[in-house]
C-alpha cells in the first residue's frame, strides 16, 4: 500500500536568481485533488495554500514581493490529498543578486580565439568574497564555480565552437547571495565549417533582458520541470 504521494515539482518564476527588491513567485505543482500545499524554507514551514476547488487545481503560487537576503535560501514543498502527504519536492535554491558590488570579467588570451586554443576567464571583485560564479547565457545556463581571494580563474581548456557565447560572472557572499553581474564578455571561437555546423551557439537573449536573469529559452527550462529541478539543485552543489 502506498504510504506517500509522488513528490511535487518546485520552480521559481521568472527565475531562481532574483535581483534584490524584485519580486519572485515560487511555484509548486502536485496533483489535482490536493487539499493543501506547504512551502518550507530551510526546513521550517513558510507558507500554506489550500486551493479551492482542489479538484481543478494542481499548481499553487507563493508570491515574494521584495527579494532580500533573508528570503534567499533553500525551499521545498509538499502537498496533501486527504490525509496522505507527498514526498518533499527537490530543493529549490533561491538566490538574491545585485548585492553590494560588481565584478570585472576578463578573458585570456582575448575574446576572439581559434578552435583548440586554451582560454581562461578571470573574475575579479575587490570586496570580501572568495567564491565566484561564471555563467554562460543560453538554454542550458552553464555555471562554473571558482575560488580566490579577490580573483578566480576559470580555465576552459582547449575551446571548440561550442564554447562560443556570452559570459558573465558573479561574486558570491554566501551560497544564496550574489553580487551584481559583471559586464558581458562575448567569446568568439572560429573553427572549420564542419565543426561550426555541428556546434551551434546556445541561443542567447539581448543584453537588455539580462536584468531579469532569464537564462533560458521561453519554452525551455522554466517549463521543463525535471531539468529545472536538476539545474536548481546542482547549481551550487
Amino acid at each position: 500500500q502506498q504510504q506517500t504521494l509522488p513528490k511535487p515539482f518546485i520552480w521559481a518564476e521568472p527565475h531562481f536568481m532574483v535581483p534584490k527588491e524584485k519580486q519572485v513567485t515560487i511555484c509548486c505543482q502536485g496533483n489535482y485533488g490536493a487539499v493543501e500545499y506547504q512551502l518550507h524554507f530551510e526546513g521550517s514551514l513558510f507558507a500554506v495554500d489550500r486551493p479551492k476547488p482542489p479538484e481543478r487545481i494542481n499548481k499553487v503560487q507563493f508570491y515574494i514581493p521584495d527579494m532580500n537576503s533573508r528570503m534567499a535560501g533553500q525551499y521545498s514543498c509538499i502537498y496533501r490529498v486527504g490525509e496522505l502527504w507527498s514526498e518533499p519536492s527537490n530543493l529549490l535554491d533561491l538566490v538574491v543578486t545585485e548585492m553590494y558590488d560588481t565584478p570585472t570579467l576578463s578573458v585570456h588570451p582575448g575574446p576572439e580565439v581559434i578552435s583548440g586554443e586554451k582560454v581562461t576567464f578571470y573574475c575579479r571583485l575587490d570586496t570580501a568574497t572568495s567564491m565566484f560564479l561564471l555563467l554562460k547565457e543560453g538554454r542550458s545556463s552553464h555555471v562554473q564555480r571558482g575560488y580566490g581571494k579577490v580573483q578566480a580563474e576559470f580555465p576552459l581548456g582547449p575551446v571548440t565552437t561550442a564554447h562560443r557565447g556570452t559570459y558573465r560572472c558573479f561574486g558570491s557572499y554566501n551560497n544564496h547571495a550574489w553580487s551584481f553581474p559583471s559586464e558581458p564578455v562575448k567569446l568568439l571561437v572560429t573553427g572549420d565549417i564542419e565543426n561550426t555546423s555541428l556546434a551551434p551557439e546556445d541561443p542567447t537573449f539581448p543584453a537588455d533582458t539580462w536584468g531579469t536573469y532569464l537564462l533560458t529559452t521561453e519554452t525551455g527550462l522554466q517549463k521543463d520541470h525535471a531539468l529545472w529541478d536538476h539545474t536548481a539543485q546542482n547549481l551550487l552543489r
Partner: nanobody, 130 residues
Framework: EVQLVESGGGLVQPGGSLRLSCAVS????????MGWFRQAPGKGLEFVAA????????YYADSVKGRFTISRDNSKNTAYLQMNSLRAEDTAVYYC???????????????????????WGQGTLVTVSS
C-alpha cells in the same frame, strides 16, 4: 505610511477570553494575507495564526488550535484574533503583521514565517493570571 495598530489586550483569568483587533491603514488591506505572532517574556517570536486575504484559508499553531480563531473584516481594514480558554502559557505580547508588496497574492495562501511579513504593529500585552 503603513500603520498596524493592535488593541484588546489586558489581564484575564485562566479559562477566560479576549478578542484582539488589528486596524490597518495606508495599504490595500483587502488583498493582503495577515498573521498574528506572539513573544512571551524571555522567549523568541512565535507564530500564532494566519489568514488569507479572502478569509478562505486559516492556519494555526498547534499550541492554539481549537482555542483561537483568526478572522478579518476587509470592509473595516481590520483583522481579529479571538482567544478562548486562555492559559498562563498564552501570556505574551501579541503582534499583528501584514505581508509586503502589491496585489499578487493567491486568495487561498497564508504565510507562517515571520520573515514573510513586511509590516508589524507595536504589540499588545496579554497577561493570563489568577
Amino acid at each position: 505610511e503603513v500603520q498596524l495598530v493592535e488593541s484588546g489586550g489586558g489581564l484575564v483569568q485562566p479559562g477566560g477570553s479576549l478578542r484582539l483587533s488589528c486596524a490597518v491603514s495606508g495599504r490595500t488591506f483587502s488583498r493582503l494575507p495577515m498573521g498574528w505572532f506572539r513573544q512571551a517574556p524571555g522567549k523568541g517570536l512565535e507564530f500564532v495564526a494566519a489568514i488569507s486575504w479572502s478569509s478562505s484559508t486559516t492556519y494555526y499553531a498547534d499550541s492554539v488550535k481549537g482555542r483561537f480563531t483568526i478572522s478579518r473584516d476587509n470592509s473595516k481594514n481590520t483583522a481579529y484574533l479571538q482567544m478562548n480558554s486562555l492559559r498562563a502559557e498564552d501570556t505574551a505580547v501579541y503582534y499583528c503583521a501584514a505581508v509586503g508588496g502589491s496585489l499578487d497574492y493567491s486568495a487561498t495562501v497564508v504565510y507562517t514565517a515571520a520573515r514573510a511579513y513586511a509590516d508589524w504593529g507595536q504589540g499588545t500585552l496579554v497577561t493570563v493570571s489568577s
